[in-house]
Amino acid sequence: CPGACVCYNEPKVTTSCPQQGLQAVPVGIPAASQRIFLHGNRISHVPAASFRACRNLTILWLHSNVLARIDAAAFTGLALLEQLDLSDNAQLRSVDPATFHGLGRLHTLHLDRCGLQELGPGLFRGLAALQYLYLQDNALQALPDDTFRDLGNLTHLFLHGNRISSVPERAFRGLHSLDRLLLHQNRVAHVHPHAFRDLGRLMTLYLFANNLSALPTEALAPLRALQYLRLNDNPWVCDCRARPLWAWLQKFRGSSSEVPCSLPQRLAGRDLKRLAANDLQGCAVATGPYHPIWTGRATDEEPLGLPKCCQPDAADKASVLEPGRPASAGNALKGRVPPGDSPPGNGSGPRHINDSPFGTLPGSAEPPLTAVRPEGSEPPGFPTSGPRRRPGCSRKNRTRSHCRLGQAGSGGGGTGDSEGS
């Protein structure tokens, strides 16, 4: 057993060396080890074949080190590995696409808070058993086509707290088992109409705290199992372009956050879901070029990149151009009591799923690596109401395993000592 480690055999053969100030993977790790805990050290490099002798290894924790480089063959020979935690290694920045090849039994991979700027082609190739992929709080700007194509058993994909600006057509191809997709706190301005085509089992989609002004309902159509949708804290344009989304939300049977309008000014702060169809008229004048839902070639429908309803001959275009009424009462940043809940002024009683602020929370001890607000915008503080609570897996046995999700903020949790401790 390496000097800084503790080794024991029951109930699993374990080599445990956490927070020992180790600067390298120790030599002499017992070959029979089924679990290796190396978290919280000062390891900066994982050389090739570091664990090759440990053929029975199922759990490897290398989180909270100072990893800057992982050799492509670092995990060679670990055919039985099920859980690999590399999170909290902010200097890592990139991972060789061959690093995880051969890990055919891997079911959980933690790569959150690793400073990742891109996902190289084929990075997740062959990880057919993977169920949980943690990529949150990195610096990812794009989702390359077919990145997750081989992950047919993936159920949870955490991509929040990155710098992703669009969701292209093939970003999520192959994710036929995906239950939960977290894309909040990014810079997403565009979602391709076919981006979610393979996500027929998706139950939870978080898109709050992005840069969406519109969302093609064609993208939502394949989401037959969707139960929880969060769209708050986006600059929604509630004019004729929002009619399809409005109609989809009226029919949606699941739980959804508020969808607060940014434009036109007369509807600012109002919830799209609670507007009447005839509120959604004309074309709001934006303070800059209109960004279409998807930047593709011009069509007969949208010859100028503008929806048909916004073209000069559109019958209802004038209503938004008239002098607007004052912005609606109700602060877009305050939670609202849904109809049927307790009357104003009476905050007691049960809290319901739509009655509170939701999003990035103040006071996190370890904020995300990246400030994920669009450039020039203020941080959300207390974003618009989303669901009060996050109902998670539909399983009712209360066993969370990897299943449960907390609320919006990111980071390592808490702010140290409590009052009175």
């Epitope: 956490p18 805990f37 978290h39 919280g40 924790w61 989180h63 959150d112 943690y134 949150q136 955490f158 929040h160 707290g161 977290l182 909040h184 939670g335 049960p350 809290r351 319901h352 799923i353 009655d355 509170s356 602020p357 939701f358 929370l361 103040p362 006071g363 996190s364 207390f382 669901p387 009060r388 609570r389 996050r390 109902p391 998670g392 897996c393 009712k396 046995n397 209360r398 066993t399 969370r400 395993s401 990897h402 299943c403 449960r404 999700l405 907390g406 609320q407 919006a408 903020g409 990111s410 980071g411 390592g412 949790g413 808490g414 702010t415 409590s418 009052e419």
Partner: antibody, heavy 125, light 107 residues
């Protein structure tokens, strides 16, 4: 700075009820998942109940089911724990605590990271 | 309910020693375990969550590891202020359950 400020100590007769408050500052109550834990003199920690953010409901330990009620007043950011039909073995310090998991997204972070100072409830005839 | 069993129930060690406390769950809880420190007359303080994640502000001499059913809290280079009772808690499902506690005394 996050704080949970609890109401003061009370002495109660057997059969009576007690309602302990836990005022949140630094956050709004609707952002948090609050749980209650008690500790009898010289004994260990015992979870009583709290908000389950997975199922959007308040859950209780079986032992206290029917005797304990957890409520919130979001207008004052105060959580309450009411325990009825008190008996001498309910003499304990009652703590409210914040569930850290509610603040995080990956949710390998479930734990009680902030606690109130505790409220001593003595049940004696 | 998941039973949590800590051992030893009490331990006495000297400043500078290394102390290990173990916690065993009656069923697999993956890595969903927290450790708390409690000093007399005070509220518990979170040390470690998710079996191995060190809570902000907690000294590096505290470390946690384990998964499945067996977990350990290790205190390297024991300090006088570490005299306290330590509790594990499973956070995998409801009801949340605590171990019975381990009392650590400094010789």
């Amino acid at each position: 700075q996050m704080q949970l400020v609890q109401s003061g100590a009370e002495v109660k007769k057997p059969g009576a009820s007690v309602k302990v408050s836990c005022k949140v500052s630094g956050y709004t109550l609707s952002e948090l998942s609050i749980h209650w834990v008690r500790q009898a003199p010289g004994k260990g920690l015992e979870w009583m109940g709290g908000f389950d953010s997975e199922d959007d409901e308040t859950v209780y330990a079986q032992k206290f089911q029917g005797r304990v009620t957890l409520t919130d007043d979001t207008s004052t950011d105060t959580a309450y724990m009411e325990l009825s039909s008190l008996r001498s073995e309910d003499t304990a310090v009652y703590y409210c605590a914040r569930d850290l998991g509610y603040l995080t997204s990956g949710n390998y972070y479930d734990a009680f990271d902030f606690w109130g100072r505790g409220t001593m409830i003595t049940v004696s005839s | 309910d998941i039973q949590m069993t800590q051992s030893p129930s009490s331990v006495s060690a000297s400043v500078g020693d290394r102390v290990t406390i173990t916690c065993r769950a009656s069923q697999d809880i993956n890595r969903w375990l927290a450790w708390y420190q409690q000093k007399p007359g005070k509220a518990p303080k979170l040390l470690i969550y998710a079996a191995s994640r060190l809570q902000s502000g907690v000294p590096l001499r505290f470390s946690g590891s384990g998964s499945g059913t067996d977990f350990t809290l290790t205190i390297n280079s024991l300090q006088p202020e570490d005299s306290a009772t330590y509790y594990c808690q499973q956070t995998n499902n409801f009801p949340r359950t605590f171990g019975q506690g381990t009392r650590l005394e400094i010789k």
